[in-house]
Interface confidence: low
């Protein structure tokens, strides 16, 4: 269940790394629980540390992707898990941390090749419980205190969604994540074809709003599906 | 109140190097990717390069790949542009910008002559 | 290399509605955005990620992409609006920033 899953001892028991630093913005990863680290505006203990629930990558930090935190596990339950280091296993780019982007199931260097062009590949090999330690981790970034207490108007620098004030989300534009206008109706907005796509946007759209999904305009005929226009329409 | 200072721009020779320099100041510099974008007289706009927020990655236009690198220093809130082996046609206004969109601001830029 | 093109110059009558155009392959399934230059000053943002508008900007400029063409459209132009004005997308297959040729609007 969910408060099982968030739970702090459930938390600590998970295998290394997922149960690391499971999604706090800027947090470090410790090697074991009740080690100090650095979480948001304070030093925090993973005894007290509450993971953060999401339903999509967006929602976590820049340094982490969503997901179910056991292997196998409930697939309804999901949190911020901290990003996956160079060479680690991983579904998709979001997994692999800044620098890093996913293929052929490994998270490789970025400066490799050129990675956003790369098609994302599927693995169905499940994850190894391969124990990272704190090394390559050196390059994450806490936010100032100030993005805790006020909400991001259009264009400030955000984490997550709840960093916006409302009718904003937060969205990739190219290595950075901003707020930006949530879609209104007759609004162009990205259908992802699959689940975890919207990893090779370098410019994201935010959702559409309360009570609209994104759909084919039903007007706009083209030759090939992939072309068609999507935007907001009423439910 | 966002600003982007350019500096260090100048008459330089062919062959010769020059380093430019963009102050920001009014933001978060560190949790931004940053460009520099160049104009030669009465042509348009020609991007340079970029470097991620945390400068882990560069990438670079064709005409300036092997001679200009970038860099930043997010301690001093700074941008920089080094070129090396200077031609006539590096010859532009050279701007430093965010081009995060709503959250897209740019220097007012600063002229680089290269010529004998 | 990923090209953009647009056309050199486009000529409307004040209150009338400017359409300028930003060619390019597939350009549909790419984010456009779209900057205003007047002689002498930086660019300005006027529309980004296809038909987003910073909250400075009027609502007469919008923005469209779809297929092979993204479009600026300036409804109820005035003459203020007269300058050149340049589309920009990510070339994710060659990680660089593209800007079109420009597009020189005068208002008659």
């Known amino acids: 269940t969910l408060n099982s899953v968030l739970n702090s001892n459930a938390i600590k028991n998970l295998p290394p790394p997922l149960g690391g630093a499971a999604g706090h913005p800027g947090s470090a990863v410790s090697a074991a629980p009740g080690i100090l680290y650095p979480g948001g505006n304070k030093y925090q203990t993973i005894d007290n540390y509450q993971p953060y629930p999401c339903a999509e990558d967006e929602e976590c930090g820049t340094d982490e992707y969503c997901a179910s935190p056991t292997r196998g596990g409930d697939a309804g339950v999901q949190i911020c898990l901290a990003c996956r280091k160079r060479r680690k296993r991983c579904m998709r780019h979001a997994m692999c941390c800044p620098g890093n982007y996913c293929k052929n199931g490994i998270c490789v260097s970025s400066d490799q090749n050129h990675f956003r062009g790369e098609i994302e590949e599927t693995i169905t090999e499940s994850f190894g419980n391969d124990h990272s330690t704190l090394d390559g981790y050196s390059r994450r970034t806490t936010l100032s205190s100030k993005m805790y207490h006020t909400k991001g108007q259009e264009g400030s620098v955000c984490l997550r969604s709840s960093d916006c004030a409302s009718g904003l989300c937060c969205a990739r534009h190219f290595w950075s994540k901003i707020c930006k206008p949530v879609l209104k109706e007759g609004q162009v907005c990205t259908k992802h074809r699959r689940k975890g796509s919207h990893g090779l946007e370098i410019f994201q759209r935010c959702y559409c709003g309360e009570g609209l999904s994104c759909r084919i305009q039903k007007d706009h005929h083209q030759a090939s599906n992939s072309s068609r226009l999507h935007t907001c329409q009423r439910h | 109140q966002v600003q982007l200072v350019e500096s260090g721009g100048g008459v330089v020779q062919p062959g010769r190097s020059l380093r430019l320099s963009c102050a920001a100041s009014?933001?978060?510099?560190?949790?931004?990717?940053m460009h520099w974008v160049r104009q030669a007289p009465g042509k348009g706009l020609e991007w340079v390069a970029i470097?991620?927020?945390?400068?882990?990655?560069?990438y670079y236009a064709d005409p300036v790949k092997g001679r200009f690198t970038i860099s930043r220093d997010n301690s001093k809130n700074t941008l920089y542009l080094q070129m090396n082996s200077l031609r006539a046609e590096d010859t532009a206004v050279y701007y430093c910008?965010?081009?995060?969109?709503?959250?897209?601001?740019w220097g007012q830029g600063t002229l680089v002559t290269v010529s004998s | 290399s990923y090209v953009l093109t647009q056309p050199p110059s486009v000529s409307v009558a004040p209150g009338q509605t400017a359409r300028i155009t930003c060619g390019g392959n597939?350009?549909?399934?790419?984010?456009v955005h779209w900057y205003q230059q007047k002689p002498g000053q930086a660019p300005v943002l006027v529309v980004y990620?296809?038909?987003d508008r910073p909250s400075e900007i009027p609502e007469r400029f919008s923005g469209s992409n779809s297929g092979n063409t993204a479009t600026l459209t300036i409804s109820r132009v005035e003459a203020g609006d007269e300058a050149d004005y340049y589309c920009?997308?990510?070339?994710?297959?060659?990680?660089?920033?593209?800007f079109g040729g420009g597009t020189r609007l005068t208002v008659l």
């Open positions: 910008a965010t081009l995060a969109a709503a959250f897209d601001y």
């Open positions: 009014g933001f978060t510099f560190s949790r931004y990717d």
């Open positions: 470097i991620f927020y945390d400068g882990s990655n560069k």
């Open positions: 597939n350009i549909g399934s790419k984010s």
């Open positions: 990620d296809d038909s």
């Open positions: 920009q997308v990510w070339d994710s297959s060659s990680d660089h920033v593209v």
